[in-house]
Amino acid sequence: LRPSRVHNSEENTMRALTLKDILNGTFSYKTFFPNWISGQEYLHQSADNNIVLYNIETGQSYTILSNRTMKSVNASNYGLSPDRQFVYLESDYSKLWRYSYTATYYIYDLSNGEFVRGNELPRPIQYLCWSPVGSKLAYVYQNNIYLKQRPGDPPFQITFNGRENKIFNGIPDWVYEEEMLATKYALWWSPNGKFLAYAEFNDTDIPVIAYSYYGDEQYPRTINIPYPKAGAKNPVVRIFIIDTTYPAYVGPQEVPVPAMIASSDYYFSWLTWVTDERVCLQWLKRVQNVSVLSICDFREDWQTWDCPKTQEHIEESRTGWAGGFFVSTPVFSYDAISYYKIFSDKDGYKHIHYIKDTVENAIQITSGKWEAINIFRVTQDSLFYSSNEFEEYPGRRNIYRISIGSYPPSKKCVTCHLRKERCQYYTASFSDYAKYYALVCYGPGIPISTLHDGRTDQEIKILEENKELENALKNIQLPKEEIKKLEVDEITLWYKMILPPQFDRSKKYPLLIQVYGGPCSQSVRSVFAVNWISYLASKEGMVIALVDGRGTAFQGDKLLYAVYRKLGVYEVEDQITAVRKFIEMGFIDEKRIAIWGWSYGGYVSSLALASGTGLFKCGIAVAPVSSWEYYASVYTERFMGLPTKDDNLEHYKNSTVMARAEYFRNVDYLLIHGTADDNVHFQNSAQIAKALVNAQVDFQAMWYSDQNHGLSGLSTNHLYTHMTHFLKQCFSLSD
């Protein structure tokens, strides 16, 4: 009896998570990504805000920029020039969209210990970066690109046609930022800084989304964003390259678009420099199942860029769209013409291929019923990549090294056995020539970041182990988590179940399904998190489940492309199927089942509630899409085609939430949206609400004034408090 008595007394000193813990970020973790500046040196901002240079080989470190200097301009970020002479300091950060922001920039001269005076940068700047060699500066101000040969020099203006909401140079417009590039920039230096490539986006003909921003003034402001919804006019993109050594000599030269792409609407998808005089561009047809990779060379005689047809590589999908979420980008080898790239193999799994001349003759480097996720680095003798191969858990990420210098190439898992229980989901960051690398483990245990030797893989030191977090969690009753799979009709449904600390299989628990379910997403991942659903399990005794159904990623094309051209069908079916299986497990109170989701998850949760199954008592949709006609062209058409009669209009029409208004009658529905959502427009929820009112269906709603898709700041606290009350009421849990 003694051991169990001791155990009980220990349990009594432990407490459940509170909502306050979650909202205060009490149990958040830290990661450590070195800011590499050479093969063996990196910069890091210390706890007291000094910028410190660490030398791995000497074990020494020294401060190159003091917190006093940082504070003098209220700097929140910095960037060292590659020649190590200057640092830009970034302040007055002002967020725009997901990645974009404007800021004020100051240049500090390290050799002289003072700020560069004269020819100061204008403000606010939309994007600024150093050349990869030396200390040239490229920046975007008021949608135009400028170049400085040295920080103190006067700027050279490269473009002149930039205009707010019309012409964007060197930065993406809204849709390219969010759905194609996933960056705040659209300019790329060549490896030695000789050339600068940039995109020009012409949004002149794009319809504008307009919404009110209420602010504090007597009259609200109207925010106008050129935003192409499905089927609308898209931005017109052009790529230019300028010689930065003699920028005025011939000026920007346009890079030609492959003929097979230019014949109809198209997108530019990415640019990769190979050498200073060779560049690789990727293009995509508007119907996103054909991608063309084009390798272009500089013609010294004409001062132009030549993209021969023989250097065009076509990637086409016959079962879905091209690529995963995005078309993958190439990683070039040292010969500067062959490259490594991830795309679907003949069995429909995304794997690394080596392309030397044609895609048809590609050599497959990895294979199996799993997927290669990311190529981190290719050196003379090694290729480092991540995959979910290990032990056949799709929600894990391990780092592998393939020796490409030897034949046959040998493969080694670098991370699989390092901290096997604690660490099953890794990413990595490599120094020059992969001399050293940092591993960042995200869980399932407490995250840890470590430094390793690139040749031996030996761990050199722990960079961040989250000791404070570990100590803080010692007296917390965390929920139990398990990742398992259901086999249903030849479909594997992986799920994560979060169980109350004293879970007892013989008892009945309320169930909350948390869903995202968007194409090429993955919710069931072996990562650490102490969040709202952890609290619901720990304190409120709920079981929470996340299920990856059809349309989700990293388990092969059959699952991924199952949703092609019919969003809103199988994702919902698979959540429902999983719920039925969970009920069969015997510990779920089938009268107390709820579902909730955000964004795409709000769409799926709404459709699940309106499925007429009677399974769900209540549910929440936060910032849901309600009709694919309301969402961005680039994203929507990738999966749905066009909303035209001769394409897929019918499914656009019958996959709306509004069409199911009648079915909400028998559920409790909470609809939530920010009025300043630039991404999933408030229009989506306004239309749901209108349809429910017209159908005389009662529902609950909450709007967040002037909040975007993230519902950040004080809205977050209000949101989670509100949703907690709603769920507790639904599940008859006392407050």
């Epitope: 050479s38 093969g39 063996q40 040196e41 240079l53 030398n55 080989e57 000497t58 020494q60 020294y62 401060t63 190159i64 920029l65 003091s66 200097t69 060292l80 190590r84 002479q85 390290l110 050799s111 210990g113 020059d432 001399k435």
Partner: nanobody, 117 residues
Framework: QVQLQESGGGLVQAGGSLRLSCAAS????????MGWYRQALGNQRELVAG???????YYPDSVKGRFTISRDNDKNTIYLQMNSLKPEDTAVYYC???????????WGQGTQVTVSS
């Protein structure tokens, strides 16, 4: 106290050559990136060459192809071989960590290089 001792400067005709040396105390030299800097009268100090511990080098365009930085790890010394010198190369030349360390009175006396036309 860390010591950096530059030497090898002098007066030279345009087109001529000089080889500068910088002896550093071990604690600072071993494994660290080092640089040669110069300061002409009335101008800011600027980098002319940098070398990492593994021998990777950097030169600004103004000296590329004319100057060569090297290091002898056994002797804790870095060198700057300067060829095809021009009058505009006239300056006091210093060695230091690359980038320099703050709050560290590391700039030595330097060595004067004068290129006459």
């Amino acid at each position: 106290q860390v010591q950096l001792q530059e030497s090898g400067g002098g007066l030279v005709q345009a087109g001529g050559s000089l080889r500068l040396s910088c002896a550093a105390s071990g604690s600072i030299f071993v494994g660290n990136a080092m640089g040669w800097y110069r300061q002409a009268l009335g101008n800011q100090r600027e980098l002319v060459a940098g070398i990492t511990s593994d021998g990777t080098t950097y030169y600004p365009d103004s000296v590329k192809g004319r100057f060569t930085i090297s290091r002898d790890n056994d002797k804790n010394t870095i060198y700057l071989q300067m060829n095809s010198l021009k009058p505009e190369d006239t300056a006091v030349y210093y060695c230091n960590l690359w980038p320099p360390r703050i709050g560290f009175a590391s700039w030595g006396q330097g060595t004067q290089v004068t290129v006459s036309s």
